[in-house]
């Protein structure tokens, strides 16, 4: 025979073709072998001009030989070489799909590889490529766009060899936080206007709570839990009212100690206090803020001061909440009763933001001692909280 060639080469098959011998022959003897692959010999009919080679090893150079037989006679042997394709990785899957991230996993090919080429493309035509190492079988995609269809493809590499690509399709979820647990998550969902929002305590859709979000102060993402601005709301309320909350979230209000406890139990929170009086402003930030549960009488933790208002909350750190009908302070007298408010009183206060609006009598008004002392009732005050790691979360959103 003559003109031995191979065609239709894949990672495991090839088709051998040849020109028949001029003389009539009984059979052709085909043999093929590769590096680290034992020789296989097959005999086919003398009127055959092609033979399908199967069960080949991927990415392997094979030597193919063929000769003709007629009775006891044998022709000379002709030889051809071919290399099988690199086989593809298998079972490419996208898991842990979020609004900005997904995890791609796959099974390696049988052949050894020098790496993988990953290509992922969004429906709008944005294409990204990345090459990963030979021992890698998963890759975290980041900085994806929410609510977007993606096609991810992977190809095995071995030196100059490239396998066929396999692909998977997935769609990122629409919102970063479908059930935001605080205003920072609402903001990271793309809501940047201050106002009323529904949050879900612990991300549980059954635990909905309407809150006012401050989306502008120092980067935004704050749950406002106290506002004093005009004296229309009565803050000389009892224990039950302070536990549950009261007032109009758009105006003067108190969010409630039970809610504060549940929110601050979700993670590490920081406190911000904004004060305004006759055109002057001041603020205080505490990088650790939490409120205990009812068993602790809503014990306050507030640490790590920075700001311009002065560190007046330090005096109240570690104190339980007091109202006129539940006296938990360390004074002989009832601080809430004496100062017509409620707070984490000690004996009695440096801060009295729930005091009597507009009352400039000593210690009776809306006071922040280290800013305006105890004989000036501050016109505007807000207390608000957000996760201490908000800056990191915000950075992630901006990159996306």
């Amino acid at each position: 025979p003559s003109g031995l060639v191979t065609a239709n080469i894949t990672d495991s098959e090839a088709l051998a073709r040849w020109q028949p011998a001029i003389a009539t022959v009984d059979s052709y003897v085909i043999s093929y072998t590769g590096e680290k692959v034992p020789e296989i010999t097959r005999t086919v009919s003398g009127n055959t001009v092609e033979y399908a080679l199967t069960d080949l090893e991927p990415a392997t150079e094979y030597t193919l030989r063929i000769f003709a037989e007629k009775g006891p006679q044998k022709s000379s042997t002709i030889t051809a070489k071919f290399t099988t394709d690199l086989d593809s990785p298998r079972d490419l899957t996208a898991t842990e799909v979020q609004s900005e991230t997904a995890l791609l996993t796959w099974r390696p090919p049988r052949a050894s590889v020098t790496g993988y080429l990953l290509v992922y493309e969004s429906v709008d035509g944005t294409v990204k490529e990345v090459i990963v190492g030979p021992d890698t079988t998963s890759y975290s995609l980041a900085d994806l766009s929410p609510s977007t269809h993606y096609t991810a493809k992977i190809q095995a590499l071995n030196g100059p060899l490239r396998s066929n690509m396999i692909q998977t399709i997935f769609t990122t979820i629409g919102l970063l936080y479908p059930f935001p647990k605080d205003c920072s998550q609402a903001m990271l969902n793309g809501d940047t206007t201050s106002g009323l929002y529904t949050i879900y305590l612990n991300g549980d859709k059954a635990e909905a709570l309407e809150v006012f979000c401050d989306m502008t102060s120092d980067g935004g993402g704050w749950i406002v839990f106290l506002r004093r601005k005009n004296g229309r709301e009565n803050f000389y309320q009892n224990w039950k009212a302070y536990a549950a909350g009261f007032g109009d979230r758009r105006e003067e209000f108190w969010l409630g100690l039970d809610n504060l406890n549940k929110i601050t139990a979700q993670g590490q929170y920081e406190l911000r206090v904004d004060l305004r009086d006759h055109g002057e402003t001041a603020f205080a930030v505490y990088d650790k803020f939490s409120v205990g549960d009812a068993k602790t009488r809503y014990k306050l933790k507030v640490e790590g001061y920075s700001g311009t208002a002065g560190d007046s909350m330090a005096y109240h750190n570690g104190r339980s909440f007091s109202t006129f009908d539940k006296d938990t302070d360390s004074a002989i007298t009832n601080c809430a009763l004496s100062y017509k408010g409620a707070f984490w009183y000690r004996n009695c206060h440096r801060v009295n933001l729930m005091g009597r609006y507009g009352d400039n009598n000593h210690s009776q008004g809306v006071n922040w001692f280290h800013w305006k002392g105890h004989e000036h009732s501050i016109q505007f005050a807000e207390m608000k909280l957000r996760p201490s790691n908000f800056r990191n979360l915000e950075g992630r959103r901006k990159r996306a």
Epitope: Y305, S306, G310, D311, A314, Y315, N317, S330, A331, I332, T333, R346, N347, C348, H349, R350, H362, S363, F369, H370, H374
Partner: antibody, heavy 120, light 107 residues
């Protein structure tokens, strides 16, 4: 146990300088404000200076403002008082005291004191 | 600055008697008042903080009361180890100031 140990006192001439140190142990030093309180021989107690836990805020009595500098090294659990332009009326036993909240404070732990005598 | 005035300056008292020391602030200080005990050659020791709270380890015969500008330290039954000088201190504002002291000695 919680302990404060002062050092650095001595006899010094008017106008000269002295640096007092206070070594703290037994508590998380940077969680607390620290203070210097002095007591002239046979007299009462006088607060001199205070510093917040982080060292970011400092406070002084009018009698020492501009002459004394309070500082702390939280890595070394140490408090310092740099006293410049010393006067005879600065003669006193100087106590290092641990605060509880910061500015406007309660002193719950005291050292044994170090004597500073300013005399020519 | 807030002035703290203690009275009396000296209080000779027999063992077992009740002792009352008063302290007056020159301005309203809520309950921001502390009491200290100092024995000769020793550092002061905190007895009462926030006008009425007993510091850990202090005997219950010591008590404090008052609010606003007038405060009292009471020793219900004077013991030999209680002979010392007692100081009040306002922690309402900086500079925190001390009273001039009350010396309780043996009668």
């Amino acid at each position: 146990q919680v302990q404060l140990v002062e050092s650095g006192g001595g006899l010094v001439q008017p106008g000269r300088s002295l640096r007092l140190s206070c070594a703290a142990s037994g508590f998380t030093f940077d969680d607390y404000a620290m203070h210097w309180v002095r007591q002239a021989p046979g007299k009462g107690l006088e607060w001199v200076s205070g510093i917040s836990g982080s060292g970011g805020s400092t406070y002084y009595a009018d009698s020492v403002k501009g002459r004394f500098t309070i500082s702390r090294d939280n890595a070394k659990n140490s408090l310092y008082l740099q006293m410049n332009s010393l006067r005879a009326e600065d003669t006193a036993l100087y106590y290092c005291a641990k605060g509880t909240v910061g500015e406007g404070d309660t002193f719950d732990i005291w050292g044994q004191g170090t004597m500073v005598t300013v005399s020519s | 600055d807030i002035q703290m005035t203690q009275s009396p300056a000296s209080l000779p008292t027999p063992v077992g008697d009740r002792v009352t020391i008063t302290c007056r602030a020159s301005q309203y200080i809520q309950g921001f008042l502390n009491w200290y005990q100092q024995k000769p050659g020793k550092a002061p020791k905190l007895l009462i903080y926030d006008a009425s709270n007993l510091e850990t380890g202090v005997p219950s015969r010591f008590s404090g009361s008052g609010s606003g500008t007038d405060f009292t330290l009471t020793i219900s039954s004077l013991q030999p180890e209680d002979f010392a000088t007692y100081y009040c201190q306002q922690s309402y504002s900086t500079p925190q100031t001390f009273g001039q002291g009350t010396k309780v000695d043996i009668k």
